[in-house]
């Protein structure tokens, strides 16, 4: 079952799927001046069995001016540095990321791919959030969103992440210091100086899953 909407947006944060559930579709989009080859797929589809999942179909782009099929070559670094997962810019996954049963990894780039990747997620998909560069988490509750089916409709859970500019926060003189954290997440001595990497403390994430570096998105 496809999710009706995109995952929720959080101010000054980006989201990333660490793996894609079977049934996920990725549109075959080409950058300006290029189009899908005539017999080319409209989308890639994450399919599989109990032991292995992979992307069916290959996206191929050709110059709008010619009718040639394209060579499958690795794009230049500047071409692959900004890829979007629906509304989010995201880099490729590290190739050594542990596989999750029933999930596909980030598909490799294709030549002349559009800079924005448009995914169609399915129920059960989870995406993870972190603050963009220059912002930090004022509060980090569960920083993920899951597409769930309730009463016959799909909805994404709301991530409890609040991102703020580095120097915006304050702890007033005489305010109690935060107590020691039972969850073992690092805390700041003074709120203005917190610079911990957001995903360093993503304890909810499966231990087997490596986090990827997020690229920034400013709104």
């Amino acid at each position: 079952e496809l999710c009706d909407d995109d995952p929720p947006e959080i101010p000054h944060a980006t989201f990333k799927a660490m793996a894609y559930k079977e049934g996920t579709m990725l549109n075959c989009e080409c950058k300006r001046g290029f189009r899908r080859i005539k017999s080319g797929s409209l989308y890639m589809l994450c399919t599989g069995n109990s032991s292995h999942s992979s992307w069916d179909n290959q996206c191929q782009c050709t110059s709008s001016a010619t009718r040639n099929t394209t060579k499958q070559v690795t794009p230049q670094p500047e071409e692959q540095k900004e890829r979007k997962t629906t509304e989010m810019q995201s880099p490729m996954q590290p190739v050594d990321q542990a596989s999750l049963p029933g999930h596909c990894r980030e598909p490799p780039p294709w030549e002349n791919e559009a800079t924005e990747r448009i995914y169609h997620f399915v129920v059960g998909q989870m995406v993870y959030y972190q603050c963009v560069q220059g912002y930090r988490a004022l509060h980090r509750g569960p920083a993920e969103s899951v597409c769930k089916m309730t009463h016959g409709k799909t909805r994404w859970t709301q991530p409890q992440l609040i991102c703020t500019g580095e120097m915006e926060t304050s702890q007033f003189p005489g305010e109690e210091k935060p107590q020691a954290s039972p969850e073992g997440r690092p805390e700041s001595e003074t709120s203005c100086l917190v610079t911990t990497t957001d995903f360093q403390i993503q304890t909810e994430m499966a231990a087997t899953m490596e986090t990827s570096i997020f690229t920034t998105e400013y709104q």
């Epitope: 004022l138 509060h139 980090r140 709301q158 609040i162 954290s181 700041s188 709120s191 917190v194």
Partner: antibody, heavy 115, light 107 residues
Framework: QVQLQQPGAELVRPGVSLKISCKGS????????MHWVRQSHAKSLEWIGV????????LYNQKFKGKATMTVDKSSSTAYLELARLTSEDSAIYYC????????WGQGTTLTVSS | DVVMTQSPASLSASVGETVTITCRAS??????LEWYQQKQGKSPQLLVY???TLAEGVPSRFSGSGSGTQFSLKINSLQPEDFGTYYC?????????FGGGTKLEMK
Amino acid sequence: QVQLQQPGAELVRPGVSLKISCKGSGYTFTDYAMHWVRQSHAKSLEWIGVISTYSGDALYNQKFKGKATMTVDKSSSTAYLELARLTSEDSAIYYCARGVTFDYWGQGTTLTVSS
Amino acid sequence: DVVMTQSPASLSASVGETVTITCRASENSYSYLEWYQQKQGKSPQLLVYNAKTLAEGVPSRFSGSGSGTQFSLKINSLQPEDFGTYYCQHHYGTPYTFGGGTKLEMK
């Protein structure tokens, strides 16, 4: 079920300070930040600030800096709003509200500042 | 600060009617906007978050739309329990600000 419990009313003299409590129950308290909102006849709803129930880190509306101080006590799942040097202008209803989208609100504490 | 301007300030309608309340932000708020309903003597209740997502338990006759600076809340087939005051609020950048409210009264 999720509940945010606040005292119903407080009557205080001008010049004193007051600490209003907001006790969360029915959920994991530290998962959700806590906001404080003031409602007065003159100004409708005004956001005072937000505090991380996890770290104690707080973000204030500039308008309330020096007037309001937010704290949390994780052991009792309670957020506090302390209001200093109270005047009749501070008479209002003070609400706590949970999470990014203010999905649950306390019933409000009606503060009356009067001599 | 972002100024949220709600219109109309008050509105009279009958049960079964459809009404629309609008909210204009003085700056781009993207889709970071909530709608709340408040009844006399009660605390506000979340109706819609992120401009268009219905909060859990909210009837489907309510719907939110818009992005950027223009937002609206539509109530189809008004029910007796829908009368009260409605507020919009943005959460893009601080301070978060609320609209002045729209009082929906029974005609």
